[in-house]
Amino acid sequence: FRDCADVFRSGLTTSGIYTLTFPNSTEETKAYCDMETGGGGWTTIQRREDGSVDFQRTWKEYKVGFGNPSGEHWLGNEFVSQLTNQQRYVLKIHLRDWEGNEAYSLYEHFYLSSEEFNYRIHLKGLTGTAGKISSISQPGNDFSTKDADNDKCICKCSQMLTGGWWFDACGPSNLNGMYYPQRQNTNKFNGIKWYYWKGSGYSLKATTMMIRPADF
């Protein structure tokens, strides 16, 4: 299977972990497929939910992925880059705060450049309930990690805010920031941030990033 849309089309319509194959390759990766949300077929590329996984990782770890697909994880920039350059994908980002509210941002077109271009993010066409302005800066930025400073700040955003992300200088989001538990989640500059939903300093309870072919 190329992605979770492929899995769904094959008749496997139960959410769970499936083995996917890199485009034009025999290399495989395991991914969580969400077969319920909005008609299913979603390949989960990131999840935060409980702080059980350390997201302050190296470039190589963000490249290949880490964590457990059934829990907190990062699928891997290389796989996502290759996949999203095969055809047009949409990106859905689902967010939960500590007060029981949920919101989402949906981008009509999403892809990552290759590693040569630092897995730069490309986004078009924002809709959803998590802000009228994109919390991932447009035009998209290069990916940065604690050992690869590709941001637009004289500081080192990834070291300062923790986690790998498409930092600007440093920008209005970081879904890979420090996980803060309830009642410790406000006034945190380095938390799990989506500015145009919750404003500055609010660290979210849970996030999911997932992709699906635009023609699904």
Epitope: E108, H109, L123, K124, G125, L126, K132, I133, P139, G140
Partner: antibody, heavy 115, light 107 residues
Framework: SEHLVESGGGLVKPGGSLRLSCATA???????MSWVRQAPGKGLEWVGS????????YLNTKFIGRFTISRDDSKNTLYLQMNSLRAEDTAVYYC?????????WGQGTLVTVSS | AIYMHQEPSSLSASVGDRVTITCHGS??????VAWYQQKPGKAPKLLIF???FKVYEVPSRFSGSGSHEDYTLTISSLQPEDFATYYC?????????FGHGTKVEIK
């Protein structure tokens, strides 16, 4: 902003026509876009907007019959066709990304209507 | 069309002053109000939208408030780079309309 660049302004006689262009970065492909104008020393005035595929157009009623908005997504370009121009149409014309409010603006192009 | 009555049309203030600009809409606007800053020869720059939501890069001294028909832009401590013209805009109804602007000048 280098992501929105207007062109096509200039001097035109009353009753004449002009087509303004706005070259847009490709990440605006799925966004509503607007034209906003500003007469010399005056305030801002919304001209009209167009949806991503060009299927929905909203024009300020005062410009209906004279101005037309269009876009060509294959060229990443927004247009404002202005006919029957009057002296009071003299202004800097801006293109902007329209989210209801305007969060990205071009640098503007000056249109002068004078005999 | 909705009329946006913006006051004052101009004001003189010193660095460090607190500045307040108001806009009154001719109809209920549901907080669908934005504020812009414009400097001579430049395009307007969005500061605030949805009545009170500050754009990320905008300094914290800028804030927006209001409801129903009445909205306010406040600059808590005026800085040299804040001398400019400010506009409100409603986007609740077509046609979108702007206030006439407030020019903030150095005293």
């Amino acid at each position: 902003s280098e992501h929105l660049v207007e062109s096509g302004g200039g001097l035109v006689k009353p009753g004449g026509s002009l087509r303004l262009s706005c070259a847009t970065a490709d990440f605006f492909e799925y966004d509503d876009m607007s034209w906003v104008r500003q007469a010399p020393g005056k305030g801002l005035e919304w001209v009209g907007s167009i949806s991503p595929k060009g299927d929905h157009k909203y024009l300020n009623t005062k410009f209906i019959g004279r101005f037309t908005i269009s876009r060509d997504d294959s060229k990443n370009t927004l247009y404002l066709q202005m006919n029957s121009l009057r002296a009071e149409d003299t202004a800097v014309y801006y293109c902007a990304r329209d989210v209801g409010f305007f969060d990205w603006w071009g640098q503007g192009t000056l249109v002068t209507v004078s005999s | 069309a909705i009329y946006m009555h913006q006051e004052p049309s101009s004001l003189s203030a010193s660095v460090g002053d607190r500045v307040t600009i108001t806009c009154h809409g001719s109809y209920w606007l549901n907080s669908e109000v934005a504020w812009y800053q414009q400097k001579p020869g430049k395009a307007p720059k969005l500061l605030i939208f949805d009545g009170d939501f500050k754009v990320y890069e905008v300094p914290s001294r800028f804030s927006g408030s209001g409801s129903h028909e009445d909205y306010t832009l406040t600059i808590s401590s005026l800085q040299p780079e804040d001398f400019a013209t400010y506009y409100c805009q409603q986007y609740r109804y077509h046609p979108y309309t702007f206030g006439h602007g407030t020019k903030v000048e150095i005293k």
